[in-house]
Interface confidence: medium
């Protein structure tokens, strides 16, 4: 008997288990149901978020003064939802507002045109006019007093600029956790601000919601380019896989309805449509907690958190015990009479059924190697299921996985044992060498920027046991190639890039980790004032000084794609030293000069330029 | 093809004892969470029981709750609701049902009548 007709059993089910977490009663006003779900303070700041991100250019006050009246108009339709324009969609209403902007056409060029068009189509010009790298100045950060002060006078400018100029900064960052990165941000200068020693209590705090927020924003941006540039069955396979692994005692069923109900959240938030989507991320926590028992034994700290910390530290969670006595998955994905029969008559329930079996089964293994051995297999069997013998031929299906599972694991080795000898600031440097071999023509300040957080990796992961390295080291990998692949798809210059990102979203690794030198690159002219350097470099940060080195270093691989690891060092020695050396002169800016002439007659000597 | 077999239903008295059991083919038994559901005469349907994949965990419906005990055997492919303490209000045609990935379900068995009466 099928079980169609007997849907009103379904409504009897006490658990919420069978009730989609998001169904919702029809609502007059969609602005007023979401004010009144959010509450004003949440509603005005993710507004705020919303706008700074589409339009990443206007003033702090002009963005406050237009949430400002979206509020105020929101509270009208609470009050009433009949009253005029609060039947309107969150996309009509904030689009209206935004096209209201005066300076439109001047700050933004071509985005201006976006307000001639109708929704959906207005708003998705919007989302296509996002830019991962807008050209605003580096956030200076003032003395702790001038700080306090600020906060003190006006905590809730302060709190809204911080959102605003991270917002604006990072137009995908997840608007949900922003809201929770804000709440440390003001927990940290409520605490700080009353201590005695104000700047070591603060700057530390400061920084480290600086990188995590980095982090956050970088992660956030990769399953929304997976959304939107390989559609929602490339991220459902990666949220399988993911959750799979960190849920493993969960049965499949409900593994595939998180799947579903975080697919919404994040396809709602990478579309900007921020309300609904802290809407729904809240009632997805509230779900996980209400069926921890079905989902995981690592739960019970989160959920007795706020909602904010709640919904983070469920994102964050360890993996789970896996289940005892795990039967082989050979019986039903290769012994089986029934494989192909099970594949044809439901393709992605089946290959999700092989992906939530081996993930849970393969904590140790990275997300992206769980999805190419589930392509791999898939691949097979739809050779195999229209072969004379199917089960013949995809008999040593599960052989073909070794290299793929081997290849990661070399590359891990080989790398931390490079991190381990070199230590953090050489690694990246090797890599600064490496990729700048590989792909010349990416502009030099995006080579530095990848290569210093690819070679972050060493001290982020090899310290991990061997059990933790891999997903660890390979699932971060692709979160900062694809940092590469967004700023590359702004101003394309390389092909090979472009292959790279575009192909295979979880073969972006391995597409990257093949490539050879580029033969056909034409080095680029010797100009030395790319290595002229000021005495303002000694009142650098010693980051800051990294950079600048590494920047030299780039531009020294431009010119000389072909200089041997032997020849570069012995330039880049040359450099720190000369460095040193005048930060060290009582007239500093005259030893920059003199000795710089010097240095670069050499390095080009030592490179034969 | 998907089957369930529930054989076993039958007449019992008050206060007495009765285990169902329910035989699964044309699917792989293990992956699925299981459950019974009821119908009594003249009533809707009401949920029972249900019983994850691996066995470890279980839902009741709480007019059932610490009289009836699912459980299953993924070598056998069968499930089983052992029922004591049974009462009058017991009485009810009692189906077998595989869940699909919501956690609905889609298939269920014939059902198996169990009347409690003295």
């Known amino acids: 008997m099928k079980w169609v007709t007997f849907i009103s059993l379904l409504f009897l089910f006490s658990s919420a288990y069978s009730r989609g977490v998001f169904r919702r009663d029809a609502h007059k006003s969609e602005v007023a149901h979401r004010f009144k779900d959010l509450g004003e303070e949440n509603f005005k700041a993710l507004v705020l978020i919303a706008f700074a991100q589409y339009l990443q250019q206007c003033p702090f006050e002009d963005h406050v003064k237009l949430v400002n009246e979206v509020t105020e108009f929101a509270k009208t339709c609470v009050a009433d939802e009949s009253a005029e324009n609060c039947d309107k969609s969150l996309h009509t209403l904030f689009g209206d507002k935004l096209c209201t902007v005066a300076t439109l056409r001047e700050t933004y060029g071509e985005m201006a045109d976006c307000c001639a068009k109708q929704e959906p189509e207005r708003n998705e010009c919007f989302l296509q006019h996002k830019d991962d790298n807008p050209n605003l100045p580096r956030l200076v950060r003032p003395e702790v007093d001038v700080m306090c002060t600020a906060f003190h006078d006006n905590e809730e400018t302060f709190l809204k600029k911080y959102l605003y100029e991270i917002a604006r900064r990072h137009p995908y960052f997840y608007a949900p956790e922003l809201l929770f990165f804000a709440k440390r941000y003001k927990a940290a200068f409520t605490e700080c601000c009353q201590a005695a020693d104000k700047a070591a209590c603060l700057l530390p705090k400061l920084d480290e919601l600086r990188d995590e927020g980095k982090a956050s924003s970088a992660k956030q941006r990769l399953k929304c380019a997976s959304l939107q540039k390989f559609g929602e069955r490339a991220f459902k396979a990666w949220a399988v896989a993911r959750l799979s692994q960190r849920f493993p005692k969960a049965e499949f069923a409900e593994v595939s309805k998180l799947v579903t109900d975080l697919t919404k959240v994040h396809t709602e938030c990478c579309h900007g449509d921020l309300l609904e989507c802290a809407d729904d991320r809240a009632d997805l926590a509230k779900y996980i907690c209400e069926n921890q028992d079905s989902i995981s034994s690592k739960l019970k700290e989160c959920c007795e958190k706020p909602l904010l910390e709640k919904s983070h530290c469920i994102a964050e969670v360890e993996n789970d015990e896996m289940p005892a006595d795990l039967p082989s998955l050979a019986a039903d994905f290769v012994e089986s009479k029934d494989v192909c029969k099970n594949y044809a008559e439901a393709k992605d329930v089946f290959l999700g059924m092989f992906l939530y079996e081996y993930a849970r089964r393969h904590p140790d293994y990275s997300v992206v190697l769980l999805l190419r051995l589930a392509k791999t297999y898939e691949t097979t069997l739809e050779k195999c299921c229209a072969a004379a013998d199917p089960h013949e031929c995809y008999a040593k299906v599960f052989d073909e996985f070794k290299p793929l599972v081997e290849e990661p694991q070399n590359l891990i080795k080989q790398n931390c044992e490079l991190f381990e000898q070199l230590g953090e600031y050489k690694f990246q440097n090797a890599l600064l060498v490496r990729y700048t071999k590989k792909v010349p023509q990416v502009s030099t300040p995006t080579l530095v920027e990848v290569s210093r957080n690819l070679g972050k990796v060493g001290s982020k992961c090899c310290k991990h046991p061997e059990a933790k390295r891999m997903p660890c080291a390979e699932d971060y990998l692709s979160v900062v190639l694809n940092q590469l692949c967004v700023l590359h798809e702004k101003t394309p210059v390389s092909d090979r890039v472009t292959k790279c990102c575009t192909e295979s979203l979880v073969n972006r690794r391995p597409c990257f980790s093949a490539l050879e030198v580029d033969e056909t690159y034409v080095p680029k002219e010797f100009n030395a004032e790319t290595f002229t350097f000021h005495a303002d470099i000694c009142t650098l940060s010693e980051k800051e000084r990294q950079i600048k080195k590494q920047t030299a270093l780039v531009e020294l691989v431009k010119h000389k794609p072909k200089a041997t690891k032997e020849q570069l060092k012995a330039v880049m020695d040359d450099f720190a030293a000369f460095v040193e050396k005048c930060c060290k002169a009582d007239d500093k800016e005259t030893c920059f000069a003199e000795e710089g002439k010097k240095l670069v007659a050499a390095s080009q000597a030592a490179l034969g330029l | 093809e998907v089957q369930l077999l529930e054989p076993g239903g039958g007449l019992v008295q008050p206060g007495g004892s009765l285990r169902l059991s329910c035989t699964a083919s044309?699917?792989?038994?293990?992956?699925?969470?299981m459950g019974w559901v009821r119908q009594a005469p003249g009533k809707g349907l009401e949920w029972v029981s249900w019983?994850?994949?691996?066995?470890?965990?279980?839902y009741y419906a709480d007019s059932v709750k610490g009289r009836f005990t699912i459980s299953r055997d993924n070598s056998k492919n069968t499930l089983y609701l052992q029922m004591n303490s049974l009462r009058a209000e017991d009485t009810a045609v009692y189906y077998c049902?595989?869940?699909?990935?919501?956690?609905?379900?889609?298939?269920w068995g014939q059902g198996t009548l169990v009347t409690v009466s003295s």
């Open positions: 049902a595989k869940s699909y990935l919501s956690g609905t379900f889609d298939y």
């Open positions: 044309g699917f792989t038994f293990r992956h699925y969470r």
């Open positions: 019983i994850r994949p691996d066995g470890t965990f279980t």
